[in-house]
Interface confidence: low
């Protein structure tokens, strides 16, 4: 049996749950810390194209799998036309960014807005112009763009022609799309994210059917999709590393999402094993090949040998180290609905600090960007979102403790989200924006919520002052 404790993979994270003080890096007595974040801490905010852009077939945009899924699977949702209409109201988004005073804006490019059928030929001019204008405006404001290439809106044509991410043909097609984006936008983009939360793409897209394309119950498909997502990411990283990094001098990663979990019985070793299994089966599934030893976690290989694809030795070498930092998502999409298989009969927890400690121990203390964090409110809540403030304070406090007390190398934080918008399987029943948008209004004004004022103050003070 291969024991990899020295290199920091596969199992070290179990120490998080141990109540033996020699084992656990998190001191639970440190409840709140009045302190500042590191001097050049990177404060930002994010959106996903499908969630906020609207205009799903305007100006030559092709349909995505989510546009199709909305029409076929989600009841009482006509289309994302009812969203915040960022495609039309770009200036209003920029004013919202100005109001908060962020250092960066994380947004995603809609693949079918650039290439309506997914194949890289001549780009849709209006789509190209939209993203180019946005980037120019950000640069002008000294706001760093962090650009996600794929936030779930696969061109429908690729799903229908190839079966989407189930088909490894898509790896090269995705790489072509990435190459185009690097060529057109790389002069203004220093931070790239290939794929947003591939776990949810695979698990809910092909396992539960709760996400597009809505396929259900085929475990082999779930892990094939995961496999192709990892290989696509790796290919794009090598592409960027070889052909674009030398002159564009940027960084590239993949956003990996996870829940956190606590043992039913804190002194029970087997419950702790189950918690480890839970984290490994969600976060480790993608993190181990990319941030670890280049392969799936040992436990997954053993338990899922009949459905989990195999990486060849050459592929392991190729996968390993294909991220310039650890981009981590911690938000409601990984908690509700939680994969009960991943829950392992244990208790889910919103302890971001412990999740960060787990990453530190498992993956050799990487530099971490919190690439998505926040909670949600009911759609009836307008601008007085006190729950969101409470959650944000809690999460930010945990990040600060992780940095100051646990020496975890978090360099940036992405509040989620800039705007109220389309929230996937929850459609418009919840809100996650720091700015309120009345979806039924014509002008879609962005009204700062209490959380926007709160986040603005945090950024201004670079943390929590007494």
């Amino acid at each position: 049996i291969l024991l990899r404790a020295v290199t920091g993979f596969s199992g070290d994270g179990r120490a998080i749950w141990s109540k033996n003080p020699n084992f656990t890096p998190v001191n639970e007595s440190q409840l709140f810390l009045y302190d500042t974040f590191p001097k050049n801490f990177f404060w930002g905010i994010g959106t996903g194209a499908l969630q906020v852009e609207g205009s799903w077939k305007k100006d030559g945009k092709g349909p995505s799998i989510w546009d199709h899924f909305i029409h076929t699977h989600l009841k009482n949702v006509s289309s994302t036309n009812g969203s915040s209409d960022s495609y039309i109201f770009l200036e209003k988004d920029l004013s919202a960014l100005d109001f908060i005073g962020v250092s960066f804006y994380q947004f995603s490019i809609s693949w079918p807005r650039l290439f309506p059928d997914g194949i890289v030929t001549v780009a849709n001019a209006k789509g190209l112009q939209y993203y180019s204008t946005l980037l120019d405006a950000l640069v002008l404001r000294n706001i760093e763009p962090i650009v996600t290439l794929y936030h779930w809106d696969l061109p429908l044509a690729l799903q229908e022609k190839y079966g989407g991410w189930k088909n490894d043909t898509i790896i090269d097609i995705f790489n072509d799309y990435a190459t185009y984006c690097f060529q057109m936008f790389g002069d203004r983009v220093k931070y790239w994210i290939t794929i947003h939360n591939p776990y949810l793409v695979a698990w809910h897209g092909y396992g539960t059917g709760m996400h597009a394309p809505g396929e259900k119950g085929n475990l082999a498909a779930v892990y094939t999709v995961g496999h192709n997502l990892i290989k696509a990411h790796s290919k794009v990283w090598h592409n960027y590393n070889t052909h674009f990094r030398p002159h564009q001098k940027g960084w590239l990663s993949i956003t990996l999402g996870s829940h956190w979990i606590e043992p039913n019985r804190s002194e029970n070793t087997m419950d702790i094993f189950k918690c480890q299994q839970s984290m490994v089966s969600v976060l480790g599934w993608f993190a181990n090949p990319i941030h670890g030893d280049g392969d799936y976690p040992e436990g997954m290989r053993k338990k899922l040998f009949s459905v989990l694809p195999i990486f060849s030795e050459a592929e392991k070498h190729e996968m390993r180290g294909t991220a310039d930092f650890f981009a981590f998502s911690f938000g409601p999409n990984n908690f509700k609905p939680l994969n009960t298989m991943a829950k392992m009969g244990q208790n889910v927890s919103l302890n971001l600090r412990e999740a960060l400690n787990w990453i530190k121990l498992e993956y050799n203390n990487p530099r971490i960007l919190i690439a998505e964090n926040g909670w949600f409110t009911d759609s009836r809540v307008k601008t007085e979102d006190t729950t969101a403030i409470y959650m944000m304070k809690n999460f930010l406090s945990q990040v600060l403790q992780a940095i100051r007390l646990d020496e975890i190398r978090v360099f940036g934080y992405t509040a989620w989200s800039l705007l109220d918008g389309f929230e996937w399987q929850d459609a418009y029943t919840i809100r996650r924006g720091l700015f309120y948008v009345d979806f039924n209004s014509k002008q879609k004004e962005r009204k700062p919520k209490s959380s926007a004022h709160y986040y603005k103050q945090i950024i201004r003070e670079n943390g929590f002052s007494l």
Partner: antibody, heavy 124, light 108 residues
Framework: QVTLKESGPVLVKPTETLTLTCTVS??????????VSWIRQPPGKALEWLAH???????SYSTSLKSRLTISKDTSKSQVVLIMTNMDPVDTATYYC????????????????WGQGTTVTVSS | SYVLTQPPSVSVAPGQTARITCGGN??????VHWYQQKPGQAPVLVVY???DRPSGIPERFSGSNSGNTATLTISRVEAGDEADYYC???????????FGGGTKLTVL
Amino acid sequence: QVTLKESGPVLVKPTETLTLTCTVSGFSLNNARMGVSWIRQPPGKALEWLAHIFSNDEKSYSTSLKSRLTISKDTSKSQVVLIMTNMDPVDTATYYCARSVVTGGYYYDGMDVWGQGTTVTVSS
Amino acid sequence: SYVLTQPPSVSVAPGQTARITCGGNNIGSESVHWYQQKPGQAPVLVVYDDSDRPSGIPERFSGSNSGNTATLTISRVEAGDEADYYCQVWDGNSDHVVFGGGTKLTVL
């Protein structure tokens, strides 16, 4: 090479306390993926698990014998000790210690290396 | 607590396939380990985690586990395979190791 060796008295009297020592080599009792179990086997009968100790010092005992058993480890000596009180002739058996392995950080993967066993007879 | 049930004995001719079962409530959701014990010797792990073989164990030994039954299969049985075989699980609810009652394999 991983080895475990049991040692202790060959003969104990009824009501006495049995102390068995398992000395390990080739691995550390501090290794987060290792644990040690004690198992016994009365003559001509099946294996019966007695107790287990994990690297973080967590212990687990057979329900039927819990009140009579204590397991502990001395990492510096690479030893695991089992104490069994109030011995009875029905406790006559071969006592084994075995290494338990956890792979992938969370799977209990059985007992991959066993000692050769020590035979204990309880008789007055 | 969790109970594992094994047949007391199984007989098979040399060269044939022996199948030793281990029954338990929803055992398919547990990891099952199998041990071989020859007379006067300590047990030896022959299959772990349902179907994995430790190094040095011949490929003739294989395992499967689903529903309420786990099975140890020994193909092309040899005289040297004659031994007692025990199945074992870790019962996560009680945090206990549980052994089956053992099966005596006789090679005819």
